[in-house]
């Protein structure tokens, strides 16, 4: 029977800069029941606080709701593991909410084949930003990436769409069924997961000629 091994805070993520969650990995338990607590202080403070919510993020997590989340202050946090034989602490982790944003995937992905009489046909792709993101404040810039491939192909074709929420693709294989997905990332932070795939059948008469 031993004191617990050193835990590690290995991930922090925020869907929208308004709330965030951090997860830790326990060290060895020393063969005894072990209690974990996350404590933190914010830059410029010495007062330590305990995690406000150990439930929302699942096991070994701490969730910071709106009233506990500030974009302006860095959080300095650590996890304490305690059993009957003693305690161990994780390394301190510095968290700036701006740099942990991972949005939900974009919504309402719509894909349509457009065949104007006077111009080349194209695939028109349109989507909406994730619900939790408020783009109106100006705090957020979302960048988008599209990927598509014929249903049976192995390789994805990637297109960077910048900040726009619609995109045209001209070169496609006629008669093929395509999968299309989109994802987003803030100007700082992490790519979202890919949206659920939308399927589109490219007509056989879809031509890439002038």
């Amino acid at each position: 029977q031993l004191p617990p091994g050193k835990p590690e805070i290995f991930k922090c993520r925020s869907p929208n800069k308004e709330t965030f969650t951090c997860w830790w990995r326990p060290g060895t338990d020393g063969g005894l029941p072990t209690n974990y607590s996350l404590t933190y202080h914010r830059e410029g403070e010495t007062l330590m606080h305990e995690c406000p919510d150990y439930i929302t993020g699942g096991p070994n997590s701490c969730h910071f709701g709106k009233q506990y989340t500030s974009m302006w202050r860095t959080y300095i946090m650590m996890v304490n593991a305690t059993n009957q034989m003693g305690s161990s602490f994780s390394d301190e982790l510095y968290v700036d909410v701006t740099y942990i944003v991972q949005p939900d995937p974009p919504l309402e992905l719509a894909v349509e084949v457009k065949q104007p009489e006077d111009r080349k046909p194209y695939l028109w792709i349109k989507w909406s930003p994730p619900t939790l993101i408020d783009l109106k404040t100006g705090w957020f810039t979302l960048l988008y990436e599209i990927r598509l491939k014929p249903e049976k192909a192995a390789e994805w074709e990637i297109h960077f769409a910048g900040q726009q929420t619609e995109f045209k693709i001209l070169s496609l294989h006629p008669g093929q069924k395509y999968l299309v997905q989109v994802r987003c990332k803030p100007d700082h932070g992490y790519w979202s997961a890919w949206s659920p795939a939308t399927f589109i059948q490219i007509p056989s008469d879809f031509t890439m000629n002038d």
């Epitope: 590690e8 290995f10 991930k11 922090c12 990995r25 830059e43 410029g44 974009m71 302006w72 860095t74 390394d91 982790l93 510095y94 968290v95 700036d96 701006t98 740099y99 942990i100 100006g138 705090w139 700082h188 992490y190 790519w191």
Partner: antibody, heavy 118, light 112 residues
Framework: QVQLQQPGAELVRPGTSVKLSCKAS????????MHWVKQRPGQGLEWIGV????????NYNQKFKGKATLTVNTSSSTAYMHLSSLTSEDSAVYYC???????????WGQGTLVTVSA | DVVMTQTPFSLPVSLGDQASISCRSS???????????LHWYLQKPGQSPKLLIY???NRFSGVPDRFSGSGSGTDFTLKISRVEAEDLELYFC?????????FGGGTKLEIK
């Protein structure tokens, strides 16, 4: 504890290339971005670029595009920087450095001294 | 790129004195999120830099309280209130508000 291990020195010929390594330990390698910084003898520091080990997404200082290429091997928790077409201007100490979830450098490797000489 | 100008290049001080290092940026370091990402690092000969101060005025873990940072916008200062022998090293300011992140040229603190 967090450690970033780098070889002490590399002697290379002009016009060739070199691949510098930075082996991370004491933390989950894919959780934190890895940066590279250049320091020429007796001079200041220059930020080269950063890589996210979880998906290999990179962001480079424009000045080092075409000169430096950042990669990772997640199975060995090692970050690499490939420097190409070496000249005497590339003779410097190269550091790998890790932030937390922040945009400053909390942990630094000891640096690799690259000497480009015929 | 944001140019970081550090003065003086070399600062002779007596032990126990206060030392003051200035850092000026070519544009405002206020980020769109309201934070100012100006940091100070210390480097000893043959070693890698170490973080002293982050976001203008926050001492990093384990940094003695004789080190303090101040400033805003484009003008920043690192003060060492009572210089000790171990402080006679090279100091760099750094900004990470704008990509690429940039550093000052360094200030060497030396004995008068």
């Amino acid at each position: 504890q967090v450690q970033l291990q780098q070889p002490g020195a590399e002697l290379v010929r002009p016009g060739t290339s070199v691949k510098l390594s930075c082996k991370a330990s004491g933390y989950t390698f894919t959780s934190f971005w890895m940066h590279w910084v250049k320091q020429r003898p007796g001079q200041g520091l220059e930020w080269i670029g950063v890589i996210d080990p979880s998906d290999s997404h990179t962001n480079y200082n424009q000045k080092f595009k075409g000169k430096a290429t950042l990669t990772v091997n997640t199975s060995s928790s090692t970050a690499y920087m490939h420097l190409s077409s070496l000249t005497s201007e590339d003779s410097a100490v190269y550091y790998c450095a890790r932030g937390d979830y922040s945009n400053w450098f909390t942990y630094w490797g000891q640096g690799t001294l690259v000497t480009v000489s015929a | 790129d944001v140019v970081m100008t550090q003065t003086p290049f070399s600062l002779p001080v007596s032990l126990g004195d206060q030392a003051s290092i200035s850092c000026r940026s070519s544009q405002s370091l206020v980020h769109s999120n309201g934070n100012t990402y100006l940091h100070w690092y210390l480097q000893k000969p043959g070693q890698s830099p170490k973080l002293l101060i982050y976001k203008v005025s926050n001492r990093f873990s384990g940094v003695p309280d004789r080190f303090s940072g101040s400033g805003s916008g484009t003008d920043f200062t690192l003060k060492i209130s009572r210089v000790e022998a171990e402080d006679l090293e090279l100091y760099f300011c750094s900004q990470s508000t704008h990509v690429p992140w940039t550093f000052g040229g360094g200030t060497k603190l030396e004995i008068k």
